[in-house]
Interface confidence: low
């Protein structure tokens, strides 16, 4: 079998959900000494970066300006050390948001419930869409999907304080093109003292590991930093 290098890690910086016309940044973390990184979109070459100096940088950032539905989809990356290529990274789904319309999110029986009560979210969007998505802020990878012509239900079952936090929903025109987010609905769950921490409520849905943690090597020391390889130019 042909020898290959370990696969790189691909991540979205700040979020994988990018408002249309804004810029997405994808990070490909590979290996020190990698002379070339390639970003692939839906299986085809999309962009190339060559870090400078390669021996001191373990990854690159790919900036995707002007996000739109044609650039939304599945991305992966690979890198090269000398003539040897890595395996392909896992796939990253990049989503364009703020398309067309804004749905309405409501919660029943209401936003303030007692632990153990059954809660259902309802997402409504009057324009043509069949899939709806519910996200808890700070947990943007945990997307719940539901289907319906103009409205979808998201039954949560008996809730605990772990369900506390702000929720938003989207209508989805395809897997990678979502509507504007709904206004947030803050769910307050009382009566359970096991977990009393509130979920973060930043509307950009941050994921703690979504930051690009690339490193550079300075002599024997490795500085862990939010590292854009351009800083060495």
């Amino acid at each position: 079998p042909k020898q290959t290098l370990p696969k790189p890690i691909i991540r979205a910086e700040s979020t994988y959900m990018v408002p249309k016309e804004k810029q997405a940044t994808l990070c490909c973390q590979g290996s020190y000494g990698a002379v070339e990184y390639q970003l692939h979109f839906e299986g085809s070459l999309f962009a190339v970066e060559r870090p400078k100096p390669p021996e001191r940088i373990n990854g690159v950032k790919f900036h995707i300006p002007d996000m739109n539905s044609r650039k939304a989809g599945r991305y992966s990356c690979i890198y090269r050390v000398g003539e040897l290529w890595s395996e392909r990274s896992d796939l990253l789904d990049l989503v364009v948001t703020e398309m067309y319309d804004t749905p309405t999110l409501s919660v029943h029986p209401g936003p303030e419930v007692t632990s153990g009560e059954k809660v259902t979210f309802y997402c409504r969007l009057d324009t043509a869409t069949s899939m709806f998505l519910l996200l808890k802020e700070g947990r943007s990878r945990d997307v719940q999907r539901s289907y319906g012509k103009v409205q979808a239900e998201f039954p949560m079952g008996p809730v605990t304080t772990a369900h506390r936090g702000s929720y938003r929903c989207f209508g989805s025109y395809n897997n990678y093109a979502w509507s504007f987010p709904s206004e947030p609905v803050k769910l307050l769950v009382t009566g359970d003292i096991e977990n009393t921490s509130l979920a973060p409520t930043d509307p950009t849905f941050p994921d703690s590991w979504d930051t690009c943690l690339l490193t550079r090597e300075t002599g024997l020391q490795k500085d862990l930093a939010l590292w854009d390889h351009t800083a060495q130019n």
């Epitope: 190339v48 002007d66 854009d228």
Partner: antibody, heavy 122, light 107 residues
Framework: QVQLQESGPGLVKPSQTLSLTCTVS?????????WNWIRQPPGKGLEWMGY???????SYNPSLESRITISRDTSKNQFSLKLSSVTAADTAVYYC???????????????WGQGTLVTVSS | DIQMTQSPSSLSASVGDRVTITCRVS??????LAWYQQKPGKAPKLLVY???TLAEGVPSRFSGSGSGTDFTLTISSLQPEDFATYYC?????????FGGGTKVEIK
Amino acid sequence: QVQLQESGPGLVKPSQTLSLTCTVSGYSITSDYAWNWIRQPPGKGLEWMGYITYSGSTSYNPSLESRITISRDTSKNQFSLKLSSVTAADTAVYYCARGGYYGSSWGVFAYWGQGTLVTVSS
Amino acid sequence: DIQMTQSPSSLSASVGDRVTITCRVSENIYSYLAWYQQKPGKAPKLLVYNAKTLAEGVPSRFSGSGSGTDFTLTISSLQPEDFATYYCQHHYGTPWTFGGGTKVEIK
């Protein structure tokens, strides 16, 4: 070294179409990056007009969208600007510029032409 | 469109002075901001991009800082060749827009 050079008439009559060409040397416009037009009215600030990318897709400033067309001639390594229905407000120095620099976005302009003054007057 | 507001619009300084120019942006642009220097009759020259990264060949007396909506360009010790007009520009989503400029003049 990448070099850009604008060319075209320096005087255009009102209501006519302004046409400029940017000739690029030292880099193929089909290899990468976005190739932009930016203008600057005399004594005023800079305005991004639009770009054509290495793959041929375009993006325009919404304020000019109804009047602007950017195209390219890959055989000559040139890209062009057409701005229709011009008025005196379109009098400016017009620059072509390459967008994209060391892994930053296409909105970073590291290479510019020297600029050409176009006056709109009858 | 994203609005860019530079201040001051002009300033007078002497060689050796520390000069600071600010750029306020109408919405969060993270670190997607560039600074340019323009001299009369010349094309703008890229100084800084990604808010704080110096472009190739730019002297280290220039530095950029800030993120979100407030950004600063600092010239640590003004040199004779630095008298020019400086522009900030966001490179987040199109349309890319520039600030109104800051003219740095000799006192």
